[in-house]
């Protein structure tokens, strides 16, 4: 009877830039599956006593669990499962309809370090690479998961990647986002957003690395063939990416309707909720389907733009078709046209 207490149980935490937090995926006989938070008879809003997931954190070589429950935003892979029986049991699971699944999130503390803290490889005086190459995305302090400056490590050598705007590297960016378990490439980040500017209070492991890489093959399919080592450059851009798996996503809610499944759309970025203003990039129902799904309602019945006769009506604006693609919301300080959405109510 397979459970997360079994020695041969395999799990991983995805959609984050650390192996110690993210959305829980488990390996069953036919591959990796995302675990729905509605498993084991739980509601998709219920938080659990995290200590029950101690074995998962242990297996990932992380510290003890801090929180366990619904992940705020679900990225649904091809396969998601709902499991039954005791919490943590995977012997009786069924495939879930992706739009009904809210993924299970787990955060483990970082492992206790017994040696002096450093998350960087030692300086370049050590022997040439032997460990497998790996990538890391360094977000600015308080920045987003799956967004930041790309660092490449090959054995003991690590550094940023020099990038010229004219480089035609779309395939490479997709490959890198994918390798980081961050979905697909959305856009390049200016270094201010990516957090390259050094904060004097930043921990020493975020100081600039001693070497730099240059793109060698933008169609590479394994990391060791993508980059070559160069002398660090004082100026010039470094590769900084925003991938589709970025976190946190914009949250939405419906207010002022007769149920939670209808109302004017409001969004939150940070602490404040504000009206979402209509935008020409969202004239299809795709945006509203996503909003309905986040409310755990059915598909869109209707949506209508409310008149913005009031020059003082303010709100937030997303320039993309879907809110999940919006890595930043823009303020609109006048003539904000609100949108009233009605979704199918699963519990009328």
């Amino acid at each position: 009877r397979l459970s997360w207490y079994d020695p041969d149980f395999q799990a991983r935490l995805t959609r984050s830039n650390s192996k110690c937090q993210g959305q829980l995926e488990v390996y069953l006989k036919d591959g990796w599956h995302m675990v729905c938070s509605q498993s084991w008879g739980r509601s998709s809003k219920q938080w659990e006593d995290p200590s029950q997931a101690s074995k998962v954190c242990q297996r990932l070589n992380c510290g003890v669990p801090l929180s366990l429950g619904p992940f705020l935003v679900t990225y649904t892979p091809q396969s998601s499962i709902i499991c039954y029986g005791q919490l943590g049991s995977f012997s009786n699971c069924s495939h879930s309809r992706n739009d009904m699944c809210h993924s299970l999130g787990l955060t483990c503390l970082e492992p206790q370090k017994t040696t002096p803290p450093t998350t960087r490889p030692p300086p370049t005086t050590t022997p040439e690479p032997t460990a497998p190459p790996r990538l890391q995305l360094v977000a600015q302090s308080g920045g987003q998961h799956c967004a930041g400056v790309v660092e490449f490590y090959s054995g003991s050598l690590g550094g940023t990647i020099s990038y010229e705007a004219q480089d035609k590297t779309q395939d490479l960016e997709n490959f890198l986002c994918n390798n980081l378990q961050c979905g697909s490439f959305l856009k390049h980040l200016p270094e201010t957003e990516a957090g390259r500017a050094q904060d004097p209070g930043e921990p020493r492991e975020h100081q600039p690395l001693p070497i730099q890489w240059k793109i060698q093959n933008s169609s590479c399919t394994s990391l060791e063939h993508c980059f070559r080592k160069i002398k660090p450059q004082k100026s010039g851009r470094v590769l900084a990416l925003l991938c589709s798996g970025f976190q946190p996503k914009v949250q939405s809610r419906l207010v002022g309707g007769s149920s939670i499944c209808e109302g004017t759309v409001e969004v939150r970025q940070g602490a404040q909720w504000a009206a979402l203003c209509d935008s020409s990039s969202a004239r299809s129902s795709l945006r509203w389907e996503e909003v309905c799904r986040e409310q755990q309602c059915g598909s869109v019945n209707s949506y209508r733009v409310l008149d913005a006769g009031d020059p003082t009506s303010r709100g937030l604006f997303c320039p993309h078709q879907k809110l999940s693609q919006c890595h930043e919301l823009w303020e609109r300080n006048s003539y904000c046209k609100k949108v009233f959405v009605t979704c199918q109510d699963p519990n009328p």
């Epitope: 801090l66 929180s67 602490a271």
Partner: nanobody, 125 residues
Framework: QVQLVESGGGLVQPGGSLRLSCVAS????????MGWFRQAPGKEREFVAV????????QYADSVKDRFTISRENAKNTVYLQMNTLKLEDTAVYYC??????????????????WGQGTQVTVSS
């Protein structure tokens, strides 16, 4: 709805000590991780420390490691931050936090649902 109330802030000289307390009400205290963030004037909120619900696990910012200790007393619904060898740069408003969103990074301010009002700590000679 969880309420968090901090106390214990004050004025202290460099090298001195302070102990902050945070009392929680309105939730299942022993299930929730609890933590501390701080915000110095003109700076972003910065992670200080966190402790798991059972108290068995802790994590600290590098800047406070070996000087600050987080602990909790579940019977009293209270979490503490013992701050030793205080430095000028520890001056900030200290906030107690709870309700960590599963799957989010520990050090992110927006990963915590509940925040106290804050208590001022000033280190000055």
């Amino acid at each position: 709805q969880v309420q968090l109330v901090e106390s214990g802030g004050g004025l202290v000289q460099p090298g001195g000590s302070l102990r902050l307390s945070c009392v929680a009400s309105g939730g299942t205290f022993s299930t929730y991780g609890m933590g501390w963030f701080r915000q110095a004037p003109g700076k972003e909120r910065e992670f200080v420390a966190v402790i798991t619900g059972s108290g068995v696990g802790t994590q600290y910012a590098d800047s406070v490691k070996d000087r600050f200790t987080i602990s909790r007393e579940n019977a009293k619904n209270t979490v503490y931050l013992q701050m030793n060898t205080l430095k000028l740069e520890d001056t900030a408003v200290y906030y107690c936090v709870s309700g960590h969103r599963p799957g989010w990074a520990v050090i992110r301010a927006d990963a915590y649902e509940y925040w106290g009002q804050g208590t001022q700590v000033t280190v000055s000679s």
